[in-house]
């Protein structure tokens, strides 16, 4: 009786080069979960389909892999990766529930100077 | 504008599987935001939801008919389809095709329904 | 499964009359229902959805209320096109089921 929540991991950050995974989890509901569609503002970095599997859109092959479980990985990040990412639940009968995940990618050097001059 | 089209016999022996059809034009079966369901009415009497399909083919149906029924989904054709098995006088109906949509975070509707198709169960 | 009551069956009504159609589930099912409306020989037709939602295109002159186990459907100026026969449908436990249907008909 969509009374579910997206559960994500929130604001994160990863360095230039790096790999990140994003993860949402839906919980309290008893809706069978049809497809997750994982978007970045308008783009689909991947779906998947409970009867089908996984899709990765092909701009996104070689830097996206799929899971663990429904999350998505991203790997060799840029500073252009920077930006919001939706995981979008569909399913039956409650319909659909969309998670936020905003990703900042960091220069590895502002990062690593971050770490050396952190205040005590 | 989407349009949905109910195609089968009219007519069904007792105790014969029901078989029916539905055709989308105007808009894809395999878009993700969609269920695609089947409904009847009995003649003179209310709805009665059978079952909805995803593309990808994951179903649901109404514990009421789940033992007699299957819907399957053709993606190639833009179609899904009924059959219902060990029909009875029962079973006399008319049969409407319907896309269930959500609006915003308010679940999935019947928005766009085929005109229906009259089956008959007799001998 | 969730049992729709509608109340009345039939309804004489007048153009230009207020019309109000009663549907009460046998459980709770907050704000998920939907009214729809069917001709003769034609398909039921989305009027409102999660119990006072107006679907795009339906006439301001339609509206719902309620939650939980009563909801109405309000016709505030009946028109010759609204006669027809009106069905609640809840839609948030499955399986989905439709109420019996409310007549209205010329007085």
């Known amino acids: 009786m969509m009374t579910g929540t997206i559960e994500t991991t929130g604001n994160i950050s990863a360095e230039k080069g790096g790999s990140i995974i994003l993860q949402c989890h839906l919980s309290s509901t008893t809706a069978q979960v049809t497809q997750v569609n994982w978007e970045q503002q308008d783009q689909l970095l991947a779906i998947c389909n409970a009867d089908l599997g996984w899709h990765i859109s092909p701009s996104f092959k070689d830097r996206v892999a799929p899971g663990p479980g429904l999350g998505l990985t991203l790997q060799s990040l840029t500073v252009n990766d920077t930006g919001e990412y939706f995981c979008i639940y569909h399913t039956y009968p409650d319909g659909t529930y969309t998670g936020r995940i905003f990703l900042e990618v960091l220069e590895s050097s502002v990062a690593e100077h971050g770490a050396r001059f952190q205040i005590p | 504008q989407l349009q949905l089209q109910e195609s089968g016999p009219g007519l069904v022996k007792p105790s014969e599987t029901l078989s029916l059809t539905c055709t989308v034009s105007g808009g894809s079966i395999s878009s993700s935001l969609y269920y695609w369901g089947w409904i009847r009415q009995p003649p003179g009497k209310g709805l009665e939801w059978i079952g909805s399909i995803y593309y990808s083919g994951s179903t649901f149906y109404n514990p009421s008919f789940k033992s007699r029924v299957t819907i399957s989904v053709d993606t190639s054709k833009n179609q899904f389809s009924l059959k219902l098995s060990s029909v009875t006088a029962a079973d006399t109906a008319v049969y409407y095709c319907a896309r269930e949509a959500g609006r915003g975070t308010t679940g999935l509707l019947f928005d766009y329904w085929g005109q229906g198709t009259l089956v008959t169960v007799s001998s | 499964d969730i049992q729709m009551t509608q109340s009345p069956s039939t309804l004489s009504a007048s153009v230009g009359d207020r019309v109000t159609i009663t549907c009460r589930a046998s459980?709770?099912?907050?704000?998920?229902l939907a009214w729809y409306q069917q001709k003769p020989g034609k398909a039921p037709k989305l009027l409102i959805y999660k119990a006072s939602s107006l679907e795009s295109g339906v006439p301001s002159r339609f509206s719902g209320s309620g939650s939980g186990t009563e909801f109405t459907l309000t016709i505030s100026s009946l028109q010759p096109d609204d006669f027809a026969t009106y069905y609640c449908?809840?839609?948030?436990?499955?399986?989905?089921?439709f109420g019996g249907g409310t007549k209205v008909e010329i007085k």
């Open positions: 449908q809840q839609y948030g436990i499955l399986p989905r089921t």
């Open positions: 459980q709770s099912i907050s704000s998920w």
